[in-house]
């Protein structure tokens, strides 16, 4: 059972969709650019991305601080139950913008802005990222991270936008964890029905990479659930 708005939207967002992404950024002053493309099934909650560092490679910091900006930011691919309005799918064809602050436990800060649009039947993502204050001997600059644990983003409406909050955990090579508090504001470019509060359960994996992480492939599975749902499904 889908609403009229979501029915109309299914004509715009197909069962299978591609995307292109361009990121420009700097981390502790090191400037870089990344180009990528991806594909996935928006109504099933799965997507893959192939990404290439086109300027500034090899990167002198851990890829893991970039990976969520391509996937956790590719929100049209989140599976939603019929009774939760899919705010970000409904924003198309106009699309949406988002901005994010990631505060890491050692004082590192990453800010991200992203513009999502639809051109010729493909999603187009323009991303800007800035990372500062990462200690030179810390896990990011020493490349000691080993990917993100599965996480749950708490979504809620506020001031005409959709807010997301996550406590994210990076796995470390020594077996420990490195934590980040992540806050994102998503805003459609046109008036769209906002959902109530719910959770998006997310699992992001690096599926392949070359030795210096200048070519990386990622896979993500993401599903919206009422606030009581667990994360077991992500591991199936």
């Amino acid at each position: 059972m889908v609403s009229k708005g979501e029915e109309d939207n299914m004509a715009i967002i197909k069962e299978f969709m591609r995307f292109k992404v361009h990121m420009e950024g700097s981390v502790n002053g090191h400037e870089f650019e990344i180009e990528g493309e991806g594909e996935g099934r928006p109504y099933e909650g799965t997507q893959t991305a192939k990404l290439k560092v086109t300027k500034g490679g090899p990167l002198p910091f851990a890829w893991d601080i970039l990976s969520p900006q391509f996937m956790y930011g590719s929100k049209a691919y989140v599976k939603h139950p019929a009774d939760i309005p899919d705010y970000l799918k409904l924003s198309f064809p106009e699309g949406f913008k988002w901005e994010r602050v990631m505060n890491f436990e050692d004082g590192g800060v990453v800010t991200v802005t992203q513009d999502s649009s639809l051109q010729d039947g493909e999603f187009i993502y323009k991303v800007k990222l800035r990372g500062t204050n990462f200690p030179s001997d810390g896990p990011v600059m020493q490349k000691k991270t080993m990917g993100w644990e599965a996480s749950s983003e708490r979504m809620y409406p506020e001031d005409g936008a959709l807010k997301g909050e996550i406590k994210q955990r990076l796995k470390l090579k020594d077996g420990g964890h490195y934590d980040a508090e992540v806050k994102t504001t998503y805003k459609a470019k046109k008036p769209v029905q906002l959902p109530g509060a719910y959770n998006v359960n997310i699992k992001l994996d690096i599926t392949s990479h070359n030795e210096d992480y200048t070519i990386v492939e990622q896979y993500e599975r993401a599903e919206g659930r009422h606030s009581t749902g667990g994360m077991d499904e992500l591991y199936k």
């Epitope: 913008k97 901005e99 602050v101 505060n103 800010t111 802005t113 800035r130 001031d159 807010k163 806050k183």
Partner: nanobody
Framework: QVQLVESGGGLVQAGGSLRLSCVAS????????MAWYRQSPGNERELVAA???????NYADSVKGRFTISMDNAKNTVYLQMNNVNAEDTAVYYC????????????????WGQGTQVTVS
């Protein structure tokens, strides 16, 4: 180029309220932030509150629950509503603006006002 003009500062009793205003003129980037900072004698300039173009808010721990930042887009004005003020809130308050990356979570805003004095007695 963005110009910022603050107003609303003055003398206020402890426990009282005050509303600061900042009128902005000029063009803004697609992702921007407006912020209030403050500086008291002998101390560094510190973030009080920031508001982004998409509506994200960022408050200093010391003012959470007491101060509210808001924007009236039609008037190009950002406000700082200060409630339940105390002596530690005495400072020169600066309005600032800039790109989201420089001004929302960092102190490197592109544009600054001249400042308005707030004194709590």
């Amino acid at each position: 180029q963005v110009q910022l003009v603050e107003s609303g500062g003055g003398l206020v009793q402890a426990g009282g309220s005050l509303r600061l205003s900042c009128v902005a003129s000029g063009s803004a980037p697609s992702f921007f932030a407006m912020a209030w900072y403050r500086q008291s004698p002998g101390n560094e300039r510190e973030l009080v509150a920031a508001l982004s173009s998409l509506g994200s808010t960022n408050y200093a721990d010391s003012v959470k629950g007491r101060f509210t930042i808001s924007m009236d887009n039609a008037k190009n004005t950002v406000y700082l509503q200060m409630n339940n003020v105390n002596a530690e809130d005495t400072a020169v308050y600066y309005c600032a603006a800039g790109d989201f990356h420089s001004c929302y979570a960092r102190k490197s805003c592109d544009y600054w006002g001249q400042g308005t004095q707030v004194t709590v007695s």
